[in-house]
Interface confidence: medium
Amino acid sequence: SGTTNTVAAYNLTWKSTNFKTILEWEPKPVNQVYTVQISTKSGDWKSKCFYTTDTECDLTDEIVKDVKQTYLARVFSYPAGNVESTGSAGEPLYENSPEFTPYLETNLGQPTIQSFEQVGTKVNVTVEDERTLVRRNNTFLSLRDVFGKDLIYTLYYWKSSSSGKKTAKTNTNEFLIDVDKGENYCFSVQAVIPSRTVNRKSTDSPVECMGQEKGEFREI
């Protein structure tokens, strides 16, 4: 129950990519505003996005403090212009979010091929180690820093002149593959956390092809 002119938020949804994490909800407010609170299982509630008319709240700063914690958020509804007003139960209406564990659930962002270098019949393909907003000792950690061995990359590569794809995997950010001399190849990579049950794979990176300026070629 609550006041007649406020409605509780619903469809609370976590949207998270590479730990950039936003809580979204409905409805668009009519004569009401929202405040969000976030907590770990054992922690105190912390308020964010005070008295907002938005239907989203960026909670990245809170969840990056420990991406292996499990978080719960709740969205409070207040009458616009009278945020002290409460529901008949003596508190504002609120709705709880699903639990969210960033390490297990954040989506893997689209990776980028940083470079490729051909030396004879070998090509070294390097994936950009994307920076996250997770900090340690005042520095931002990369995706590899955070996930360590849990993160692998899959490389898809094929001759420019054909469509038959080959694959390679690495648990670093580099691939060393064999290619046919004199052939141009195209590459795409995908970030994968094989042991996840949800959000296991990123979208594929943009395709990069030999003969374009990303690469460097040294014939031996």
């Epitope: 299982k41 054992s42 420990d66 292996k68 914690q69 499990t70 564990t101 390490y103 297990l104 061995k149 849990d150 692998i152 995997k169 690495t170 648990n171 956390i193 094989p194 042991s195 996840r196």
Partner: antibody
């Protein structure tokens, strides 16, 4: 259903080697690190090392690094742990365990008892 | 390597009692702690991961808490089938290390 089935008990003489197998089923074998943990009689758990079944890359506990070798056979979804230069204090139950996302060991084999005795 | 100190090494409690086991890490392990149950002659079973998350199928009477160096494992109402040895393990930094174990018995 995830299952890790280990080879049977072994009795070895000091100085010999033992190779324990762990056959995985019910999941993608190459998607999870396989770990080996041992437990001496009446004692606690001791981590020996882990292997990435996808690449064959291994990490060892420094204590065992000179004597333990971890391998996998992707064609049979089997992980192996070989311990050489056995001594009486290596008498223990040896477990394989699948490492879950983020570190914990979610599935364990039934254990293989290795007895080292002259 | 990170040392894990678990206490007590054994305890005796009555059915229905609240049982608490503590584990102290020699350096911060963030939330990188797991708890296992091992019954005599059986393999260990994962109960808690990331310090406070119950693993699939684990009854709600088992819980974990803590952060950094100090961690607690609780059985809210001890049942006869909970007789076992319980181990903490840090999975924050290799080599992964275990506590010495706590043997739980029924009075």
């Amino acid at each position: 259903e995830v299952q890790l089935v280990q080879s049977g008990a072994e009795v070895k003489k000091p100085g010999a080697s033992v190779k324990v197998s762990c056959k995985a089923s019910g999941y993608s074998f190459t998607g999870y690190y396989m770990n080996w943990v041992r437990q001496a009689p009446g004692q606690g758990l001791e981590w020996m090392g882990e292997i990435n079944p996808s690449t064959g890359g291994s990490t060892y506990n420094q204590k065992f690094k000179a004597r333990v070798t971890l391998t996998v056979d992707q064609s049979t979804n089997t992980a192996y742990m070989e311990l050489s230069s056995l001594r009486s204090e290596d008498t223990a139950v040896y477990y394989c365990a699948r490492r879950e996302l983020g570190g914990p060991f979610g599935y364990w084999g039934q254990g293989t008892t290795v007895t080292v005795s002259s | 390597s990170i040392q894990m100190t678990q206490s007590p090494s054994s305890l005796s409690a009555s059915v229905g009692d609240r049982v608490t086991i503590t584990c102290k890490a020699s350096q911060s392990v963030s939330t990188g702690i797991a708890w296992y149950q091992q019954k005599p002659g059986k393999s260990p079973k994962l109960l808690i991961y990331f310090a406070s998350n119950r693993y699939t199928g684990v009854p709600s009477r088992f819980s974990g808490s803590g952060y950094g160096t100090d961690f607690t494992f609780t059985i809210s109402s001890l049942q006869p089938e909970d007789i076992a040895t319980y181990y903490c393990q840090q999975d924050y930094s290799s080599p992964w290390t275990f506590g010495g174990g706590t043997k739980v018995e029924i009075k």
